[in-house]
Interface confidence: medium
């Protein structure tokens, strides 16, 4: 099922044009998206086709800063959005308790070295519940066709994965078990091969700050949850978690 969702997400990616002709990279974004009032949405961008190191990603709504994900300093959510914005997954951002006022343009700004700055644009439309349901009825035939195609793809993937997993089951179990042991002990997990300075670390525990001093009780559970996610190749901003 995860593979299917990943494929659906990948098919929805849009490529954003770049400001400078000198830079080789491209930013892929989720493009134009809609969500229901009161619901939540994940904003995702992905930088590809460049070897530049990502030093920081800024998330902005029009001219307002929502969040920063810095390779060394970790996540920072703007104080005015802390109650409704959650870091991740990966370098993405989760917007919660959506209101109609959240409709508008969102930008992911990648600070990279040596390329410079890349910007991706996402347009979010927050719909009233009834409008969202009404819109969904028209999408059913299209979704049916897509679903049929995806069922074929997924079946093939599941067969391949099942065969591969039989061989790797023991090794995977041991890796995940090790991650769980580390998280249960409240230790900050850092990659065995630390990423080069200035790169956004791609294997971490819970998003930085979620397990701060004031959020201690849920820490082990969050660490466990995000460790499993990171094993499924979803990166995160920083390995820094506060435990004292």
């Amino acid at each position: 099922m995860r593979w299917c969702l990943l494929l659906i997400w990948a098919q929805g990616l849009r490529q954003a044009p770049l400001a400078s002709g000198m830079m080789t990279g491209t930013i892929e974004t989720t493009g134009n998206i809609s969500a229901e009032k009161g619901g939540s949405i994940i904003l995702q961008c992905h930088l590809s086709s460049t070897t530049a190191q990502v030093t920081q990603v800024n998330w902005e709504q029009q001219d307002q800063l929502l969040a920063i994900c810095n390779a060394d300093l970790g996540w920072h959510i703007s104080p005015s959005f802390k109650d409704r914005v959650a870091p991740g997954p990966g370098l993405g951002l989760t917007l919660q308790s959506l209101t109609v006022n959240d409709t508008g343009e969102y930008f992911c700004i990648y600070h990279t070295y040596p390329d410079g700055t890349y910007t991706g644009r996402i347009f979010l439309e927050v719909l009233e519940s009834s409008v969202a349901e009404h819109g969904a009825r028209f999408q059913i035939p299209l979704l049916g066709a897509m679903a049929a195609t995806l069922v074929v793809i997924c079946t093939a993937v599941i067969v391949v994965v099942a065969l591969t997993r039989k061989k790797k089951a023991l090794r995977i179990h041991s890796v995940e078990g090790d991650l769980r042991r580390k998280s249960a002990g409240q230790e900050e997990w850092s990659p065995s091969a630390p990423s080069p300075p200035g790169s956004c670390v791609q294997a971490e525990a819970a998003p930085a700050g979620l397990c701060g001093e004031q959020r201690g009780e849920d820490c082990a559970e969050l660490h466990d949850y995000f460790n499993v996610l990171s094993y499924r190749s979803l990166g995160n901003c920083s390995f820094f978690t506060e435990t004292g």
């Epitope: 850092s190 700050g209 920083s238 820094f240 435990t243």
Partner: antibody, heavy 119, light 106 residues
Framework: QVQLVQSGAEVKKPGASVKVSCKAS????????MHWVRQAPGQRLEWIGY????????KYNEKFKGRATLTSDKSASTAYMELSSLRSEDTAVYYC????????????WGQGTLVTVSS | EIVLTQSPATLSLSPGERATLSCNAS?????VHWYQQKPGQAPRPWIY???KLASGIPARFSGSGSGTSYTLTISSLEPEDFAVYYC?????????FGQGTKVEIK
């Protein structure tokens, strides 16, 4: 409890170098960023730079680039700040400070090391 | 580079009085932090992100503001509150501090 203990006061001649240490205890050393800040007599606090203690990545204030070097000894849970080509205006108290993730602030500070540059 | 300017430079007040310290940014910023420093000591975190009191800070302290203007208020000064207060900002890739406001006994 978290503690940052810095090395003692230093007196240096212009043109010399100084290396200040900051020994951390009470937390996982490599899971935090360490910043260095200085304060000249009667002046505001001035940020020098930081070191990512997991991967030794550094970032410097442009003013100190090429003169300041931040390093660490993970086995000793100690961070170092070396400043070269000292001049009289480098006379200041130098602080190490741990970065508080998510708030983007410095939550624990060393007691400070006075570096006097005088001929 | 964003510059933080604190005012006044010195505030002379008596215990029990109300103190209002200002921190102005040269352009709009998301938040500031406040630190307290006493002579011969290292700065201590006092207020995080505009208004969150650091651990152990008494409720007579409060922070407010937005955009370019931020304020630290001490509702009724106690003898131990006389010190220098600095505001601080992280603005990629630089950390900047205000020049400080000294709260002294009148």
């Amino acid at each position: 409890q978290v503690q940052l203990v810095q090395s003692g006061a230093e007196v240096k001649k212009p043109g010399a170098s100084v290396k200040v240490s900051c020994k951390a205890s009470g937390y996982t050393f490599t899971s935090y960023v360490m910043h260095w800040v200085r304060q000249a007599p009667g002046q505001r606090l001035e940020w020098i730079g930081y070191i990512n203690l997991n991967n030794d990545g550094t970032k410097y204030n442009e003013k100190f680039k090429g003169r300041a070097t931040l390093t660490s000894d993970k086995s000793a849970s100690t961070a170092y700040m070396e400043l070269s080509s000292l001049r009289s205006e480098d006379t200041a108290v130098y602080y190490c400070a741990r970065w508080r993730v998510y708030y983007y602030a410095m939550d624990y500070w060393g007691q400070g090391t006075l570096v006097t540059v005088s001929s | 580079e964003i510059v933080l300017t604190q005012s006044p430079a010195t505030l002379s007040l008596s215990p029990g009085e109300r103190a209002t310290l200002s921190c102005n940014a040269s352009s709009s910023v998301d938040y500031v932090h406040w630190y307290q420093q006493k002579p011969g000591q290292a700065p201590r975190p006092w207020i995080y992100e505009i208004s969150k009191l650091a651990s152990g800070i008494p409720a007579r302290f409060s922070g407010s503001g937005s955009g370019t203007s931020y304020t630290l208020t001490i509702s009724s000064l106690e003898p131990e509150d006389f010190a220098v207060y600095y505001c601080q900002l992280w603005n990629y890739p630089l950390i900047t501090f205000g020049q400080g406001t000294k709260v002294e006994i009148k």
